[in-house]
Interface confidence: low
């Protein structure tokens, strides 16, 4: 895992005095633009929780490795999720810190939780400042649950989180309902990608069992080890004080890490500095307990004293995690009678000895089969044994054999044999095989043949189009399993070749041969039936269609709508590019004609079977717009309507409409007939007294024609209020129609 | 009234042959994915395989595939499964369904095949 | 292939009760779950597809709910005619899939 540490200085007396601090142990790392590559990124993530606007926050740089971010000057400031980013390449890693008010209503009994794939993760809102509403959680800022605030359970709202998978992974809240979000109990889960102890592709891999509370990576398998501890265990303490991954970084302030949170890549999260717990991490472990959050316990025997920041100190003659081992003639610990190494790596090998006096570096030795003595590069100091580290020089296949590693010290000496294995990488000596092909995906199986040694642990298809020189495209597919190659183009030749892997570094192939596999485009076989059709105007038609809905994939990329207008001898074709379609607008079609319509499903440049036809006859276009539309109040309940005809009318009007609609209002409009044609004035009745009116008409032939301008006009006086408005055209009453 | 009628089912010996058909009446059969489902003496429901509209697709559960071809002749509005190399553990009762909607909404009364020497 | 596992498999219950048969998917199969009710010497007859929606004249009293893996029946009020066998069964890929089926007896 990449030396990245955010330290967040929790004295909250003063924001002013609040700052985080951004620590990366890596070589050179945040440079910037040199060969090194990105600087260290600070800064505060507003995208979930998000504060007022205040003075923008100050960024110091110190060296290359270190940054640092003040100038808060309110709590509010503080509250939210802050991030660091650092590394370069794809080492890139962004560690995480969330924010808490101290002043919350609710309060979270443990920031961030680290859970395994699988597990039930439970998150904790404390009640600090109770209110009597419900309590709102919320997942990456989105509504996720609500509970009723009389279901507290201790004072405590829970928010239990069943078979977790790493999408769950985010920041969660809990809020009081309209309380402000800053009063929220901020979480932060953290989902690892592999059930409990396993990590890698397929988590088929055991983690080597983290100690002193140390997670095991998902993806790499390394330990990220809790703040002051080292070593790939996290087996050594660092001395009081220190951090980072080999201890090289020191707690700033004469209080050491005394209110200190730390927070470390994930999947470790955040937590106090060895030997400190509690909400702002101010409080001394208790007797007995030690490390990160005080959470692991001493147990010591054979006298051995409780250090709160490292544990067990031994008496002389003792040593072990609980001085529970005694001192003695050297001794090689735990070596495997057999390690397996791939042909041309250069691993790392690793022999631990104990004993008294203690073995040193120089006293651990490694001999390979042709008599070579290796000296140790590194050791790994720790209180019940030291922890040889080799870097053997590029393997050939004449180092398979027998290897020996050896202690010597004054108290004596122990040597362990053990077999290296040197195996060839496979190489596939054919190309992969097509099972079935469709326009968009090619199924193919790709364990074939191969030269050199298995097990095969995974098999990389690499694959692009024929002829092409873009980058290859490639999938990592268990051994066992057929591999789909989706998202292809339809009818085109794709060059495939498959690289297979052996277990262990170094363990990738030779690319094998490449063949040529061409997608296919078969013909849509399911025929669409026109399940309805409206007219929703004199020229736009609703079409709706259905197909039937069976098992399996659909073959089809959209539908193909066809209007053959008979009379023009012409064809309109409207494409609909989604095969989830079963609706469509058709618009701009010619008032009053007779179109036979029918739809088809298509997949690439191919047509299925066209539906039964419908015959769909428009309704024609209606007169135009009256003219002059005047309006004129005669009473506190009564409005006459003038107009004159529509010029250049295509057949005698049957009637005229008349829209009445209280200015302003939020109602439906009503519709008046004037049913006498000729007319052309109108008495609207019935309306309330002191109140603004809008009228428009539109006159009607076969179709409603075009609405004529809006007028508005108020009734007179302050009478009573009228049922309704009705309408009278001279001498005689006429219907309403709404 | 939508109807499918099964017929063809009977005795027959390990390793031999028999077809069953399916006739559709009452909705236009071209239009319809038709699948054969069977069901052992007192066991639960089991897929056996699938046909589209015109027939280019066919989909077979793998205890029968390679060794029974459904088929369909949608001028007859029939519906086939052609068995083959038949085994003990074919005996059921085979039904014929009309699929529509992601789900068999219509079901023959089904035909007995008994596979026994 | 995608295994359906029903539960319970035998259930006894009386006129008027309320009764759930619960169906679980091995992998997620989004809302592509239906529901079939069979009477001993008959062929299956469908109640529920795409989870939720209830065939045509289905009773109400019969209801489905359940998306991914986890999907249930339940039937309101347990009528003389409503015992039987039901299966649930799964559309989503191919081999089209059935569970083992729950029996509902009259206690």
């Known amino acids: 895992a990449v030396d990245l540490t955010l330290l967040a200085n929790l004295r909250l007396t003063d924001p002013q005095r609040f700052f985080l601090t951004c620590v990366s142990g890596e070589a050179g790392a945040g440079r910037g633009s040199d060969a090194w590559g990105p600087p260290l990124l600070l800064e505060k993530d507003d995208r979930i929780v998000r504060t007022p606007p205040g003075p923008p926050l100050r960024l110091a740089r110190n060296g290359s490795h270190q940054v640092t971010l003040r100038g808060f000057s309110k709590p509010s400031d503080l509250v939210g999720v802050f991030s660091c980013v650092g590394g370069a390449g794809a080492r890139r890693t962004r560690v995480i810190y969330v924010h808490n008010s101290p002043g919350a209503h609710l309060l979270p009994d443990k920031v961030t939780h680290t859970v395994n794939k699988g597990d039930t993760a439970v998150l904790s809102a404390r009640v600090h400042k109770e209110k009597q509403t419900d309590v709102i959680w919320k997942s990456n800022g989105s509504y996720f649950y609500t509970l009723d605030w009389h279901e507290a359970q201790d004072g405590r709202f829970l928010l239990q989180l069943p078979n977790v998978q790493p999408p769950s992974s985010g920041i969660y809240s809990a809020t009081y309902l309209e309380a402000s979000p800053l009063g929220s109990a901020f979480f932060r889960l953290i989902v690892r990608g592999c059930g409990a102890g396993r990590w890698g592709p397929g988590c088929t891999k055991e983690c080597p069992g983290c100690l002193h509370g140390g997670v095991c990576h998902d993806h790499d398998g390394e330990c990220v080890c809790p703040p002051g501890f080292t070593g790939t265990r996290c087996e050594q303490a660092c001395r009081e004080g220190r951090f980072g991954q080999s201890c090289q970084e020191q707690c700033p302030g004469i209080s050491g890490c005394r209110g200190l949170t730390f927070c470390l890549p994930d999947p470790y999260g955040c937590s106090c500095g060895s030997g400190w717990r509690g909400s702002q991490c101010q409080e001394a472990c208790a007797p007995g307990h030690f490390g990160a959050d005080c959470r692991l316990q001493c147990q010591c025997q054979n006298g051995g004293t409780c250090d709160r920041f490292s544990g067990c100190v031994c008496p002389s003659g003792w040593h072990g995690v609980h001085c529970e081992k005694s001192d003695r003639i050297p001794q090689i610990l735990n070596m495997a009678s057999e390690l397996e190494f791939n042909l041309e790596t250069m691993p790392r090998i690793n022999c631990a000895a104990a004993g008294n006096p203690f073995p040193v570096r120089g006293s651990i030795e490694l001999r390979k089969p042709d008599g070579t003595v290796l000296l140790s590069t590194k050791a790994i100091v720790e209180p019940e044994k030291t922890t040889a580290e080799f870097e053997v020089p590029r393997l050939v296949l004449a180092d398979s054999g027998f290897w020996e590693c050896r202690v010597s010290t004054s108290g004596g000496q122990d040597s362990r044999r053990f077999k290296v294995n040197v195996k060839v990488p496979p190489v596939p000596l054919a190309a992969p095989r097509l099972l079935t092909k469709q326009s968009r995906q090619l199924v193919v199986s790709p364990l074939v043949s191969f030269s050199g040694d298995g097990p095969i642990s995974t098999v990389r298809l690499h694959y692009r189009p024929q002829d092409s020189t873009m980058d290859w495209s490639t999938i990592v597919v268990d051994p066992s399993e057929n591999v789909t190659l989706m998202n292809l183009r339809p009818k085109t030749g794709y060059s495939v070749r498959v690289q297979l892997s052996r277990p262990g570094e170094g363990g990738e192939g030779a690319w094998g041969p490449p063949t040529l596999m061409t997608t296919d485009c078969p013909e849509p076989l399911l025929q669409p039936w026109l399940e309805g059709w409206h007219v929703e105007g004199t020229d736009r038609l609703r079409v709706s269609w259905s197909l039937p809905l069976v098992p399996g994939p659909l073959v089809g990329d959209g539908f193909l709508l066809r209007l053959w207008d008979g009379t023009r001898g012409q064809e309109r074709r409207e494409n609909v590019s989604s095969p989830q379609a079963r609706t469509a607008l058709l618009t701009g079609l010619t008032p009053g004609t007779h179109y036979q319509l029918d739809v088809q499903l298509y997949h690439c440049t191919l047509l299925g079977p066209a539906s039964p036809p419908a015959h769909v006859l428009l309704p024609p276009s209606g007169p135009p717009a009256p003219r002059h539309l005047h309006a004129q109040a005669l009473s506190d309940s009564e409005i006459q309507l003038t107009w004159k005809h529509p010029e250049a009318l295509p057949g005698p009007i049957s009637k005229y409409v008349v829209e009445v609609q209280v200015a302003g209002g939020a109602g439906d409009p009503l519709w008046i007939d004037v049913d006498r044609p000729e007319e052309t004035s109108t008495i609207i009745r019935g309306l309330n007294a002191s109140t603004r009116y809008l009228f428009r008409m539109r006159a009607s032939i076969q179709g409603l024609g075009d609405w004529s301008n809006t007028v508005e006009e108020s009734t007179l006086g302050n009478g009573l209020q009228a049922e309704g408005p009705v309408q009278e055209s001279r001498a005689a009453e006429e219907g309403l129609d709404q | 009234e939508v109807q499918l009628l099964e017929s063809g089912g009977g005795l027959v010996q390990p390793g031999g042959s028999l077809r069953l058909s399916c006739a559709a009446s009452?909705?236009?059969?071209?239009?319809?994915?038709m699948l054969w489902v069977r069901q052992a003496p007192g066991k639960g429901l089991e897929w056996v395989s699938v046909?589209?509209?015109?027939?280019?697709?066919?989909y077979y559960a793998d205890s029968v595939k390679g060794r029974f071809t459904i088929s369909r002749d949608n001028s007859k509005n029939t519906l086939y499964l052609q068995m083959n190399s038949l085994r003990a553990e074919d005996t059921a009762v085979y039904y014929c369904?009309?699929?529509?909607?992601?789900?068999?909404?219509?079901w023959g009364q089904g035909t007995m095949v008994t596979v026994s020497s | 292939d995608i295994q359906m596992t029903q539960s319970p498999s035998f259930l006894s219950a009386s006129v008027g009760d309320r009764v759930t048969i619960t169906c679980r998917a091995s992998?997620?199969?989004?809302?592509?779950l239906a529901w079939y009710q069979q009477k001993p010497g008959k062929a299956p007859k469908l109640l529920i597809y795409?989870?939720?929606t209830l065939q045509s004249g289905v009773p109400s009293r019969f209801s489905g709910s359940g998306s991914g893996t986890e999907f249930t029946l339940a039937i309101s009020t347990l009528q003389p005619e409503d015992f039987a066998t039901y299966y649930c069964?799964?559309?989503?890929?191919?081999?089209?899939?059935f569970g083992q089926g729950t029996r509902l007896e009259i206690k």
């Open positions: 369904a009309r699929g529509v909607l992601r789900a068999f909404d219509i």
């Open positions: 009452g909705f236009t059969f071209s239009r319809y994915v």
């Open positions: 046909i589209y509209p015109s027939g280019g697709y066919t």
């Open positions: 992998q997620g199969i989004s809302t592509y």
């Open positions: 795409a989870t939720s």
């Open positions: 069964q799964q559309l989503n890929s191919y081999p089209i899939t």
